[in-house]
């Protein structure tokens, strides 16, 4: 029961996290105009990963997409890539985790298979969450660097009389959404991994008895703890810890239920 609850909760937390990562990626407010210590402007600028917007005090908002690919800063491209990778991994993880849920019965799927899928999706959620956190953090670092550079430039020239006020940008709402969403996805992934461990004992104990009783160790150990086994063999007595040290290739080649983030 506790395993089912942990798995279900992990799924829900990851689902919320991935929805948040998608929302953050689509949001326009990654960076917003810093209004502190600035002349009172009637124009408010904010920027996202895909377009920049200007809201006038009249109420009109104008957004323009970044229609160039090569002209964009490498850091912005990197952030875009990290967020997209996070979304893709999360989406796959979600798909896998749906099939891995203990409360959902699909054909004659064994618990060992569900455990493997749970672990896979858990790992995918963890990586997805890390991608989102990394993406948001890279962008935040870029903002901080640019903020202090523009602050230094702001009061230079014309003996302190500023001819052109340089627009400074600070953290937008999307950064906080991204950090929280990435964290939730990460937590959800960890919960899925914990749930996967919880699925092991019943089967393992049963196998252990069978192993000692029969003495046919080879017949009851198709893969044992070998990392290379992956998901290739789904025999009834296969140990569910097989995927514990799985390689990256194996994780990607087999759809995992935890990749919904």
């Amino acid at each position: 029961m506790a395993v089912t609850a942990c798995q279900g909760l992990g799924f829900v937390v990851s689902l919320i996290g991935i929805a948040g990562i998608i929302a953050a990626t689509c949001m326009d407010q990654w960076s917003t105009q810093d209004l502190y210590n600035n002349p009172v402007t009637a124009v408010f600028n904010y920027q996202g990963l895909w377009r920049s917007c200007v809201r006038e005090s009249s109420g009109f908002t104008e957004c323009r997409g970044y229609f160039t690919l090569l002209g964009l800063p490498a850091m912005l491209q990197a952030v875009r890539a990290l967020m997209i990778v996070g979304i893709v991994l999360g989406a796959i993880g979600l798909l896998v985790s749906i099939f891995a849920l203990k409360c959902i019965r699909i054909g004659s799927m064994e618990d060992s298979a569900k455990a493997n899928m749970t672990l896979t999706s858990g790992i995918m959620f963890i990586v997805s969450g890390l991608c989102a956190i990394a993406g948001v953090s890279v962008f935040a670092n870029m903002l901080v660097t640019n903020f202090w550079m523009s602050t230094a430039n702001m009061y230079t020239g014309m003996g302190g009389m500023v001819q052109t006020v340089q627009t400074r940008y600070t953290f937008g709402a999307a950064l906080f959404v991204g950090w929280v969403a990435g964290g939730l996805t990460l937590i959800g992934g960890v919960m899925m991994c914990i749930a996967c461990r919880g699925l092991a004992p019943e089967e393992t104990n049963y196998k252990a008895v069978s192993y000692h009783a029969s003495g046919h160790s080879v017949a009851y150990k198709p893969g044992g703890f070998k990392a290379s086994t992956g998901f290739g063999s789904n025999t009834k007595n296969k140990k569910i810890y097989d995927g514990g040290a799985r390689t990256e290739d194996e994780v990607q080649s087999y759809p995992s239920k935890h990749d919904y983030v």
Partner: antibody, heavy 118, light 113 residues
């Protein structure tokens, strides 16, 4: 056709109060920011107050801050300007204006004259 | 507050002539976010309220004849009337719409000979 009609102007003594109204029609009033702009006898134009579409944000220049209050009733399509502690330098033609692209005043009323004199 | 200086204060021209009036701001009115200049031009004919001519320095308001053209960027702006008509007799005001309190210039009075 956009129409803005001001009312409530008149002669008032220094230190007195007055409330101006602006009835709007011909557009979705609740979607636009609105302003009061005055024109002094020497033809100089000056922004008096601005309010956003839902009334949640207002702006006043230092010359009227604390004395004038802009408000709106979107249900009645009406803009208001409550003026108190009036001074002789507040004597002007007061226009109600609708904000548009580029924070410009796209439409103006015919104005209402406010004279502050003893 | 941002200072807006208009010149000349008045000018007299004959119908059909080209007219240029300028407007200077003490600070740049160019917004880096959308690369637009927040300067507006108005025309006020005698006994009437001001009428919007140009916004974003060079975008003509609908219904405004194309003989009116706005140009400039940053701190220096110009309103040009390519061929003045008798009905253009008015005072022309420029306004900063970037910084509050949206200061207006003192106006350029256009008179026709």
């Amino acid at each position: 056709e956009v129409q803005l009609v001001e009312s409530g102007g008149g002669l008032v003594q220094p230190g007195g109060s007055l409330k101006l109204s602006c009835a709007a029609s011909g557009f979705t009033f609740s979607s636009y920011g609105m302003s009061w702009v005055r024109q002094t006898p020497d033809k100089r134009l000056e922004l008096v107050a601005t309010i956003n579409s839902n009334g949640g944000s207002t702006y006043y220049p230092d010359s009227v801050k604390g004395r004038f209050t802009i408000s709106r009733d979107n249900a009645k399509n009406t803009l208001y300007l409550q003026m108190s502690s009036l001074k002789s330098e507040d004597t002007a033609m007061y226009y109600c204006a609708r904000l548009s692209y580029g924070n410009s005043f796209a439409n103006w009323g015919q104005g209402t004259l406010v004279t502050v004199s003893s | 507050d941002i200072q807006i200086t208009q010149s000349p204060s008045s000018l007299t021209v004959t119908a059909g002539e080209k007219v240029t009036m300028s407007c200077q701001s003490s600070q740049s009115l160019l917004n880096s976010g959308n690369h637009r200049n927040y300067l507006t031009w108005y025309q006020q004919k005698p006994g009437q309220p001001p009428k919007l001519l140009m916004y974003w320095a060079s975008t003509r308001e609908s219904g405004v004849p194309d003989r009116f053209a706005g140009s400039g960027s940053g701190t220096d702006f110009t309103l040009t009337i390519s061929s003045v008509q008798a009905e253009d007799l008015a005072i022309y005001y420029c306004q900063n719409t970037y910084y509050y309190p949206f200061t207006f210039g003192s106006g350029t009075k256009l008179e026709i000979k």
